[in-house]
Interface confidence: low
């Protein structure tokens, strides 16, 4: 498994971390850190582990996290109610 | 070649339940989720939910929440939707379709040949 | 919910002359530069068939005279050179929060 650094699927990163679409250079995917309490999220990154290529930057929020709407547009990894 | 196989049509009573099977073969059954689509008669396209066949975990259309159920069969390659308290405007055409994993652009690239849902008293 | 209004409901178009459906949706569909919105045609008695997805990426086998574009809130679906096979009912779709929501649907003829 890659650990850090470029990645395809997530099944070549390590536990707890996805692969990504990079922040800085969108052609590329690296694994990435699951999602946080509080870090920002997408709604609809929820496939755990996902077999085609993402399409976000963010991971999936950690379990026990839920990815929740905190004001127009903008949604974080927050407890599960 | 991708095949997603429906059970057949279906007539129930006003607050029966109805289960709907949809058989997959033709890929790995585990690598893709699962949608659920239903198109009453005439009418337009409504989005159920989908389960993820790898892991089993489910999002409902809140529309349907604590009436429907989706469930997988890893053994068989089978997608289940049940719904329960069955009312006539229940009464369409249900399809399974495939997640076409494209990312987080959910869309869905192949759909069974339908099961029609007849709700009459 | 988000909810898709697509326009006109019905379209007739002479043989090899362009079709133009609209679809717009009441909320924004993007997200990190991308749009979520997916294209598919019902002919009748038929499943919906995936023509676009995220916008304008045409589906693997679907011909190249469908096109779809647009961002935010305003989208279209483009046939350039209609043909007989393309008689159908066309559905615009937003994948960007569920649930996922049609639009109600343009039917499109030959004129």
């Known amino acids: 498994a890659v650990i850090t650094g470029a990645c395809d699927k997530d099944s070549q990163c390590g536990g707890g971390m996805c692969c990504a679409v990079s922040i800085w250079v969108k052609s590329i995917r690296i694994c990435t850190p699951m999602g946080k309490l509080g870090d920002s999220c997408h709604p609809l990154t929820r496939k755990v582990p996902f077999f085609g290529r993402r399409m976000h930057h963010t991971c999936p929020c950690l379990p026990g996290l839920a990815c929740l709407r905190t004001s127009f547009n903008r949604f974080i990894c927050l407890a599960q109610k | 070649e991708v095949q997603l196989v429906q059970s057949g049509a279906e007539v129930k009573k006003p607050g029966a339940s109805v289960k709907v099977s949809c058989k997959a073969s033709?890929?790995?059954?585990?690598?893709?989720?699962m949608h659920w689509v239903r198109q009453a008669p005439g009418q337009g396209l409504e989005w159920i939910g989908y389960i993820s066949c790898y892991n089993g975990a489910t999002t409902y259309n809140q529309k349907f929440k604590g009436r429907v159920t989706i469930t997988v069969d890893k053994s068989t390659s089978t997608a289940y939707l049940e719904l329960s308290s069955l009312r006539s405007e229940d009464t369409a055409v249900y399809y399974c379709?495939?997640?076409?994993?494209?990312?987080?652009?959910?869309?869905?690239?192949?759909w069974g040949q339908g099961t029609l849902v007849t709700v009459s008293s | 919910d988000i909810v898709m209004t697509q326009s006109p409901d019905s379209l007739a178009v002479s043989l090899g002359e362009r079709a133009t459906i609209n679809c717009k949706a009441s909320?924004?569909?993007?997200?990190?530069?991308?749009?979520?919105m997916n294209w598919y045609q019902q002919k009748p008695g038929q499943p919906p068939k995936l023509l676009i997805y995220a916008a304008s990426n045409l589906e693997s086998g679907v011909p190249d005279r469908f096109s779809g574009s647009g961002s935010g809130t305003d989208f279209t679906l483009t046939i350039s050179s209609l043909q007989a096979e393309d008689v159908a009912v066309y559905y615009c779709?937003?994948?960007?929060?569920?649930?996922?929501?049609f639009g109600q649907g343009t039917k499109v003829e030959i004129k």
């Open positions: 779709q937003q994948i960007n929060e569920d649930p996922f929501t």
């Open positions: 379709a495939r997640d076409g994993n494209y990312g987080e652009a959910y869309a869905m690239d192949y």
């Open positions: 909320q924004s569909v993007d997200y990190d530069g991308d749009s979520y």
């Open positions: 033709g890929y790995s059954f585990t690598d893709y989720d």
